[in-house]
């Protein structure tokens, strides 16, 4: 469970991938497309408002019912629209909601290395936004194996302004 | 119920070594990033290295880089400081400490070990 | 890397009385700001972590504030077992850094 509704805290952050390939949101035909490609020199990295929530671990997953919090993430990157998990078509969506958010918009926070994080489905653990075909996909990870698989990793440039002006 | 407890401290010479264990239990070890942070007599605390969960990141203070290895033993549960080199400056109270947050160092350190000292003198 | 100053250094202060020490980083953390309380020959334990969240089994006179640069940790009632070093901490990023630390000892 989310512990509370409120977020701990927001961050207004560009999203890229390990390989340095920038996230960007077009609107197209009154829906939200992502994109994963390469931005011309002089373009301005499209802005992702994070919002970091604490979670209990659900007790299946705690050995001994100890291993308290995990942080989650909801991910918005223009005004009532955020990224969603969907689990059958094992893509990543945005979609326009209100709160409380389902449990699709929410990711576990995995912190990989120095600026590199993973973002885990709440609603299917095991599988993370990837990046496949120059596009945001669900791909299932064997923890024993390909944690650190680079197209699960992306960076996040923290934006130094005022978070709630980013709509 | 959470337990960090070191060992391994004691008294060694300048540019000698010594190894540092932290044995964790009451949580899912491999869940979490481990830390060392130490506090030279009389004085503050400071951050000496962090390893991720996988065991497959770690990172360092500039005042210990290339000298101290820091490492984890998932079978066992314990995670390690290896300290080589050492100097005068290196002697402190060296605690593990637990994070918050699975899989993520956001949070803060809410177990620490009860600490062990080493001394570094001729 | 990211600095952490504190002040005051000390306080001296009497039982009852409301603290408020100070903490900011030299470049912005969001809220990924810890305080510690650490009392003689003991090891750091955790009072506050995200800036405000208060940790398990604190009292609640201690509470936590801020964001970006400026936290504020307030003891609002000093008790006995208050006396000791607070310390704050960045966990925004690598290497983490920890405050010089606010004695807080008896008028």
């Known amino acids: 469970s989310i512990t509370g509704i409120s977020p701990i805290t927001e961050s207004l952050a560009s999203l890229s991938t390990y390989n340095d390939q920038s996230i960007t949101f077009a609107l197209e035909d009154e829906s939200y497309e992502i994109y994963v490609e390469d931005l011309k020199k002089d373009k301005k990295k499209d802005k992702v408002l994070l919002s970091y929530y604490e979670s209990q671990h659900p007790s299946s997953e705690s050995g001994d019912g100890v291993d308290g919090k995990m942080l989650m993430v909801t991910l918005s990157p223009t005004k009532d629209f955020w990224l969603q998990a969907n689990n059958k078509e094992h893509s990543v969506e945005l979609h326009k909601c209100e709160k409380p958010l389902p449990d699709q918009a929410f990711f576990v926070l995995h912190n990989r290395s120095f600026n590199c994080v993973s973002f885990e489905c709440k609603t299917d653990p095991g599988v993370f936004i990837g990046v496949k075909d120059n596009h945001l996909a669900l791909i299932k990870v064997d923890y024993s194996e390909n944690l650190g698989s680079e197209n699960i990793l992306f960076k996040l440039s923290e934006i130094l302004e005022h978070h709630h002006h980013h709509h | 119920e959470v337990q960090l407890v070191e060992s391994g401290g004691g008294l060694v010479q300048p540019g000698g070594s010594l190894r540092l264990s932290c044995a964790a239990s009451?949580?899912?070890?491999?869940?979490?990033?481990m830390t060392w942070v130490r506090q030279a007599p009389g004085k503050g605390l400071e951050w000496v290295s962090t390893i991720s969960g996988s065991g497959d990141n770690t990172y360092y203070a500039d005042s210990v880089q290339g000298r101290f290895t820091i490492s984890r033993g998932h079978s066992k549960n314990t995670l390690y400081l290896q300290m080589n080199s050492l100097r005068a400056e290196d002697t402190a109270v060296y605690y593990c400490?637990?994070?918050?947050?699975?899989?993520?160092?956001?949070?803060?350190?809410?177990?620490w070990g009860q600490g062990t000292m080493v001394t570094v003198s001729s | 890397d990211i600095q952490m100053t504190q002040s005051p250094s000390s306080v001296s202060a009497s039982v009852g009385d409301r603290v408020t020490i100070t903490c900011r980083a030299s470049q912005g953390i969001s809220s990924w700001l810890a305080w510690y309380q650490q009392k003689p020959g003991k090891a750091p334990q955790l009072l506050i972590y995200?800036?405000?969240r208060l940790q398990s089994g604190v009292p609640s006179r201690f509470w936590g504030s801020g964001s970006g640069t400026d936290f504020t940790l307030t003891i609002s009632s000093l008790q006995p077992e208050d006396f000791a070093t607070y310390y704050c901490q960045q966990a925004n990023n690598f290497p983490f850094t920890f405050g010089p630390g606010t004695k807080v000892d008896i008028k």
């Open positions: 400490a637990k994070p918050t947050y699975s899989r993520s160092w956001y949070g803060a350190f809410d177990f």
């Open positions: 009451g949580f899912t070890f491999s869940n979490y990033a």
């Open positions: 995200a800036a405000s």
